[in-house]
């Protein structure tokens, strides 16, 4: 039969510049001699010759002199070769293939990888900076493969996704210098962090910056939003109120207005330098520019949608700067339940029923409450599932397993907890006249 | 190091449009604003507008609204400026600078005759 | 357009003595003002930003000073390559606007 050949299972990794093993190993029989064994070491791809042993001898490296077998190990299996210096061009798979009497092959994949370097980030523009201003954030490391992974994040660890570009480019070792850049809007403060994964090593490297724009002396704005959620039906427009007390003499020139979502800092709209820079949020925002003078910065958010909710900062800037957050919280009523009943005929006491009440189409998700005809709970024997569709809208479908009585009506309520609206129905059920005895 | 480089000077005909060209290097070009400034000789600096090269918004002094038309081509971190309908009055030096409130680097400036 | 309005329009110093000039605009500014030096046949340079913070790498004889809308650039110990005209912009308002200048000379 043929010549059992094993190799890890696992690709090999090496870093760039250090020395790898890629091992290989046969069981040699009783009374072998290495005038036996013929091993081949190959490019699996190309069938490159790289390293080989015949009639007795080390035929040496084919691999440009980086290429070392194991003599003392041979006798004992031990085929494994070591390959020196390692470089980015040597990943791939290489086949270690032993001949003696019978012959047998198998590949061992090499993933080569270097660290990157710690990022430097620079911030431009990077003197008088102002809330409301749009700065660039690089964040640059060097000499890494393979090609890293690239994340963003503000001071509370929040992912920043939006407006963010990353190249990578490959020098002649082939090796990687990657090149972050994040354009993001000034808030009062903030950290921006940058961090480098190297998916091979597992390895993060990461770098902050912390930008304070400049305050004016005269103080701060005092920015105004309501403490409770703004609750809008989906589909529906909705304000998010926020005001400031503009001092006398105030013009329009002088207001930077930013709204942003407060976790990921994307822009949603924004008015600076006398005019309004339109909606950033798929078009469905708008200000209300006559009131803007007197104060009224709040934000029109047309025909709602679930993936709206949320928190959004009013930003304002004048001489200098205030915010303030506003939670929006969506709603969508849910419909009158359907109630089903199954088995639906030839009902009687004693019977086990599945009663099953669906509504649909609302958010958040409901509360959904069972009872029977005299109001008494029932809460044994209930499952409810909810499911989101697209749009994120649940419809909710609850079963209740209920034995049957002589008569019995049952309830299903569906709460929506926002809008603190109860959607209800029921089903009255009239069992059979009874049989004495019972038929089985 | 950053530079903005412009050329040294235009000779064009009354009536004539112009393109002037700013070359941006030394620094991330779509990071900052680029703005553009008249000088007449022995006279004071006029802004004429700035444009921001990561999305060409633009801004202008409404005295250059009909005058000026500022572009960017990114690929070669170049910002331009087209003057139309020429008259001697526009004979002037223009700069490049790039920033939003300050001007921290500002190109040599060419130098516009209009003259038949 | 916010009107800037520099004096003098022109004046003469001594090595070593301490020159004044004054930008005034014409509404409130807060503090959002620079002062450039441009000497003969170059290009304008920043020396000053937000009132009183010195561009890297100006000497330090220079300063400024004033919010709202009385401003004022010193030089201190006046040198001969301090020849120059020096002027005000405000970065508070759109459209920007600068004064019309102080021409330096060395006496």
């Known amino acids: 039969g043929a010549l059992e050949v094993q190799v890890p299972e696992d690709p090999v990794v090496a870093l760039v510049g250090t020395d790898a093993t890629l091992c290989c190993s046969f069981s040699p029989e009783p009374g072998f001699s290495l005038a036996q064994l013929n091993l081949i070491w190959q490019l699996t791809d190309t069938k490159q010759l790289v390293h080989s042993f015949a009639e007795g001898q080390d035929q040496g490296s084919a691999y440009a002199n980086r290429t070392a077998l194991f003599p003392d190990l041979l006798a004992q299996g031990n085929a494994s070769l070591r390959l020196q210096r390692v470089r980015v061009a040597d990943e791939g798979s290489f086949t270690c293939f032993v001949s003696i009497r019978d012959f047998g092959s198998a590949a061992v994949s090499l993933q080569v990888a270097a660290p990157y370097s710690k990022p430097s980030m620079t911030l431009e523009p990077n003197k008088d900076l102002r809330p409301g201003d749009t700065v660039t954030i690089t964040c640059s490391s060097y000499q890494g493969y393979p090609e890293a992974e690239v994340f963003w994040q503000d001071g509370q660890g929040v992912p920043l996704t939006g407006n963010v570009t990353t190249s990578q480019m490959a020098n002649e070792q082939g090796l990687f210098d990657v090149h972050s850049i994040l354009r993001v809007v000034l808030g009062a403060n903030g950290t921006y962090s940058c961090l480098v994964r190297n998916p091979v090593l597992q390895q993060d490297a990461h770098s902050s910056v912390t930008i304070t724009p400049q305050r004016s002396p005269t103080g701060a704005v005092e920015v105004q939003v309501p403490e409770d959620p703004v609750v809008a039906l989906v589909g529906t427009d909705a304000t998010l109120r926020c005001s400031f007390s503009p001092e006398p003499g105030f013009s329009l020139a002088q207001l930077n207005l930013i709204w942003q979502l407060t976790d990921t800092k994307q822009l949603v709209h924004s008015f600076t330098e006398g005019r309004d820079q339109g909606s950033a949020y798929a078009n469905r925002t708008a200000l209300f520019p006559d009131l803007l003078a007197q104060g009224n910065a709040s934000l029109r958010l047309q025909r709602v949608r679930v993936a709206d909710e949320g928190s959004f900062t009013c930003f304002v800037s004048i001489r200098d700067f205030g915010s303030a957050a506003v939670s929006l919280q969506v709603a969508a009523p849910y419909s009158k339940p359907s109630m089903t009943l199954e088995p639906n005929k030839d009902l009687r006491p004693g019977d086990t029923v599945t009663i099953t009440c669906s509504s649909y189409r609302g958010y958040p998700e409901a509360e959904v409450f069972w009872q029977d005809g005299q109001g008494v709970p029932l809460t044994g024997n209930v499952t409810t599932s909810q499911m989101a569709n697209e749009q994120g809208l649940f419809d909710v479908h609850s079963v209740l397993r209920v034995v049957l009585g002589a008569n019995g009506t049952y309830s299903c309520l569906v709460r929506n907890p926002v809008l603190q609206q109860d959607a209800h129905g029921s089903v009255t059920i009239t069992g059979q006249p009874m049989t004495f005895p019972p038929e089985a | 190091q950053v530079q903005l480089q412009q050329p040294g000077a235009e000779l064009v005909r009354p009536g004539a449009s112009v393109k002037l060209s700013c070359k941006a290097s030394g620094y991330t070009f779509t990071a900052y604003w680029m703005n553009w400034v008249k000088q007449r000789p022995d006279q004071g600096l006029e802004w004429i507008g700035r444009?921001?090269?990561?999305?060409?918004?633009?801004r202008y002094n409404q005295n250059f609204r009909d005058k000026a038309r500022l572009t960017v081509d990114k690929s070669s971190s170049t910002a331009y400026m087209q003057l139309s309908s020429l008259t001697s009055e526009d004979s002037a030096v223009f700069y490049c600078a790039r920033g939003v409130r300050i001007f921290d680097y500002w190109g040599q400036g060419t130098t516009l005759t209009v003259s038949s | 357009d916010i009107q800037m309005t520099q004096s003098p329009a022109s004046l003469a110093a001594s090595v070593g003595e301490t020159v004044t000039i004054t930008c005034r605009t014409s509404e409130n500014i807060d503090y959002t003002l620079a002062w450039y030096q441009q000497k003969p046949g170059k290009s304008p340079q920043l020396l000053i930003y937000?009132?009183?913070t010195l561009e890297d790498g100006v000497p330090s004889r220079f300063s400024g000073s004033g919010s709202g809308t009385l401003f004022s650039l010193k030089i201190n110990n006046m040198q001969p390559e301090d020849t120059a005209t020096y002027f005000c912009k405000q970065a508070y308002d759109v459209p920007r606007t600068f004064g019309g200048g102080t021409k330096l000379e060395i006496k």
């Open positions: 444009i921001d090269p990561y999305d060409s918004e633009t």
């Open positions: 937000n009132a009183n």
